[in-house]
Interface confidence: low
């Protein structure tokens, strides 16, 4: 028998520095977790103690904090090289800055293979990107070899900016021939490493013949055997065992997100490459694990540029950006309109001639808007200004909801109107009219939404049974501010870009902004 230790991360999302327990900015070091310096300490400890170790990443290193905003992927290559990752799969967020934003900072700089079997380049890009990412890689580990085959969510064109010269194929269809090829090369230990979410990970384990282990990402799935060490609730045991169509027990793993845990899986193979046993658990990277001093010093050196960036002008406003709670928790506010417009703009994807865009709607809890921005400071808007408006380090995510769920959400928005509560919704691509003289739960008297399957966008009444795409803060997608109906009834949820980054990019693009209050939210006569 031969034993392999797989160490794995996924959905790190730019958390290079240690973070708080909820993966936001670290303040109290005694409570902080994760970060590449701490990760390196634990990885080195395991490398010294165990003979056959692979360190793998299942995608979405890109996007999530000011580190990515400033360094645009160079920080990913630098620190992943420093940690000596063995392989990485491409995630959807790796395409957030277009293909160029992937090629230059990461693909050309990484000293480890970057993988995806279901992304095929065409046209002029095919020669430019050739060899920079691979469908699979055979890695020598001790006296043996292990094949790693990569995959990426086929939804990436809707979630990011891969352009028109990359085709995202069905994962299972694309993986099978690559695994078969590895078998012909006498590689009998094969890991599928990818970024399509836990449901697809399980399907790959079930359907792709020859895959021994699946290491996944995208769905931020936390698996754990026994009592979990922090606040994450396990979606199942670690590893999650799937019985394949040909009768094999295939371990599937994922390690939550944000570098909070290091996945730790021990696999025992027989001489024919069959999995005899698998066990392990994610390791919580808490403050009991010291940060490696050399990596920490490097982090501090790279940080200097971040501090400077915070005070640089992104663009100008020529109007007061009203982000006060007195406005945003009671009525349409122009800060809410600005943020929603930025959220939609960030999700422009012309993927189908029938649709002007795949999504037209935005909702945003007024309580998430924490500060106004005064135009009388020469109109200057900085990252620091935006950090005061959006201080929680969230993301703006894409969900699919039925019209009936949206209706419930808008009823919840005003169910206790007038108490300055955070659930009052700001909107984009939506016209809502409330009648506050009616009973809570029956106050939405008109709800019109902007069409997507149209060449000239216009507002149509919401249909209860229709499925709509909506951009919203991850806080709402997770049921925050009492929006339990969103969490319970959403049909799909894909995590998006860092909230401040979305707004800062929009402001930089527009250069000068002047959002207005324009009648997106109205109150029927006599009630307000």
């Amino acid at each position: 028998a031969w034993e392999l230790t797989i160490l794995h991360t996924n959905d790190v999302h730019s958390r290079l520095e240690q973070t708080s327990e909820d993966s936001s900015k670290c303040v109290n070091a005694s409570r902080c977790m994760g970060g590449v310096a701490r990760l390196f300490t634990k990885v080195q400890q395991i490398r010294r103690a165990e003979p056959n170790v692979l360190l793998l990443d299942a995608g979405d290193q890109y996007q999530g904090t000011i580190w990515f905003t400033v360094y645009k992927g160079a920080e990913v290559a630098h620190f992943m090289n420093a940690l000596r990752y063995d392989a990485m799969a491409l995630g959807n967020h790796e395409f957030d800055n277009g293909v160029e934003g992937l090629i230059e900072p990461l693909l050309k700089e990484a000293k480890f293979p970057i993988l995806s079997a279901n992304i095929k380049a065409k046209g002029p890009l095919a020669s430019q990107i050739s060899g920079l990412y691979l469908p699979y890689k055979v890695l020598p580990v001790g006296d043996e070899v292990v094949g790693i085959v990569g995959y990426t969510s086929k939804e990436t064109p809707f979630l990011s900016n891969p352009g028109t010269n990359l085709v995202f194929e069905d994962e299972i269809t694309a993986l099978q021939p690559e695994v078969d090829k590895l078998k012909t090369l006498n590689v009998n230990k094969i890991i599928a490493l990818g970024h399509s979410g836990f449901e697809m990970d399980k399907l790959i384990a079930q359907k792709v013949r020859g895959v021994d282990v699946v290491v996944g990402g995208h769905s931020n799935t936390f698996l754990y055997t026994g009592n979990p060490p922090s606040k994450e609730v396990p979606a199942g045991k670690y590893p999650f065992i799937v019985t394949s169509d040909d009768g094999r027990k295939v371990p599937v793993v994922q390690a939550y997100a944000f570098g909070k845990y290091l996945g730790y899986l021990k696999i025992e193979f027989d001489e024919r490459g069959n999995v005899i046993s698998s066990h392990g658990n994610p390791i919580l990277l808490n403050s009991s694990i010291p940060e490696d001093p050399s990596i920490k010093a490097d982090i501090n050196k790279w940080r200097i540029k971040l501090d400077n960036y915070s005070t640089q002008e992104l663009g100008k406003t020529i109007v007061y950006l009203d982000g006060s709670s007195q406005s945003c928790r009671f009525r349409e506010c122009n800060m809410g309109n600005l943020i929603c417009d930025a959220m939609i703009n960030n999700n422009l994807r012309h993927t189908d001639e029938m649709f002007w865009n795949h999504v037209s709607m935005c909702i945003l809890n007024g309580g998430g808007i924490r500060s106004p921005i005064d135009e009388r400071n020469n109109g200057t808007i900085t990252w620091e200004n935006l950090a005061a408006v959006l201080p929680f380090g969230g993301t703006f995510d894409l969900v699919q909801l039925k019209g009936s769920t949206l209706k419930k959400a808008f009823e919840h928005s005003v169910h206790r109107y007038g108490q300055s509560t955070g659930e009052f919704l700001q909107v984009g691509g939506i016209h809502v009219v409330y009648d506050l003289s009616r009973k809570p739960g029956d106050r939405v008297v008109k709800l019109d939404v902007l069409c997507t399957k149209c060449r000239v966008p216009s507002y149509d009444p919401l249909k209860m049974d229709e499925v709509y795409k909506v951009i919203l803060p991850n806080f709402l997608a997770n049921g925050g501010d009492g929006f339990q109906m969103i969490k319970d009834e959403l049909l799909r949820h894909d995590s998006g870009d860092q909230d401040i980054n979305v707004v800062s990019t929009y402001i930089s693009k527009m250069k000068v902004i002047y959002p207005a209050v324009e009648g997106r939210i109205k109150f029927s006569t006599g009630s307000h």
């Epitope: 909820d22 936001s24 303040v27 109290n28 070091a29 950090a387 201080p391 929680f392």
Partner: antibody, heavy 122, light 111 residues
Framework: QVQLVQSGAEVEKPGASVKVSCKAS????????ITWVRQAPGQGLEWMGD????????NYNEKFKTRVTITADKSTSTAYMELSSLRSEDTAVYYC???????????????WGQGTLVTVSS | EIVLTQSPATLSLSPGERATLSCRAS??????????MHWYQQKPGQAPRLLIY???NLESGIPPRFSGSGYGTDFTLTINNIESEDAAYYFC?????????FGQGTKVEIK
């Protein structure tokens, strides 16, 4: 609405232990830190320690570390603070408080229990 | 640990006047644009009540005559147009590092 209801006043002898309870309602108990603060008669506030009920993680003020134990029962949404080896200077009102904010990096105490008077007297 | 020093110890004002309460930390409690300083009001026989969090944010339900400011080590709680119901003890508290500590308090009296 958020409420923290503490157990009633206690009179203990020096050297004994006391266990004060704090029952939480109106919010997700496992998602917010519970802090214990004490106030001796006519004095200021003193941070004793806290617990994250979701994971059982605790932090203690070094001053009390050997004598205080903070626990939480998720099934009843109740936090407990036990102080052992009591002495007369431990006579104080003991408060539990919820750490608030949409982000755990806030740590301000947004809701407080009514306080429990513990008198240590022989 | 970080020591918080409040001044003055007692402040005696007439209704309508402005109260300025100071809290000085022995070490920085601000970082990256955030100030981990909070203010509480406590009336006799009652539990403290949060007024201001993160130096300048007014807690929900607190009258707007209360405001907070400061960055680094020096922080101020201001009460404009003070009213008789504002007579109380006021405490500052930091949450920059463990252990969190409180100031010794300022007593505000209304003449």
């Amino acid at each position: 609405q958020v409420q923290l209801v503490q157990s009633g006043a206690e009179v203990e002898k020096p050297g004994a232990s006391v266990k004060v309870s704090c029952k939480a309602s109106g919010y997700t108990f496992t998602s917010y830190w519970i802090t214990w603060v004490r106030q001796a008669p006519g004095q200021g506030l003193e941070w004793m320690g806290d617990i994250y009920p979701g994971s059982g993680n605790t932090n203690y003020n070094e001053k009390f570390k050997t004598r205080v134990t903070i626990t939480a029962d998720k099934s009843t949404s109740t936090a407990y603070m036990e102080l052992s080896s009591l002495r007369s200077e431990d006579t104080a009102v003991y408060y539990c408080a919820k750490e608030g904010g949409l982000t755990t990096e806030d740590y301000a105490l947004d809701y407080w229990g009514q306080g429990t008077l513990v008198t240590v007297s022989s | 640990e970080i020591v918080l020093t409040q001044s003055p110890a007692t402040l005696s004002l007439s209704p309508g006047e402005r109260a300025t309460l100071s809290c000085r930390a022995s070490k920085q409690v601000s970082t990256s644009g955030y100030s981990y300083m909070h203010w509480y009001q406590q009336k006799p026989g009652q539990a403290p009540r949060l007024l201001i969090y993160l130096a300048s944010n007014l807690e929900s339900g607190i009258p707007p005559r209360f405001s907070g400011s400061g960055y680094g080590t020096d922080f101020t709680l201001t009460i404009n147009n003070i009213e008789s119901e504002d007579a109380a003890y006021y405490f500052c508290q930091h949450s920059r590092e463990l252990p969190f500590t409180f100031g010794q308090g300022t007593k505000v009296e209304i003449k």
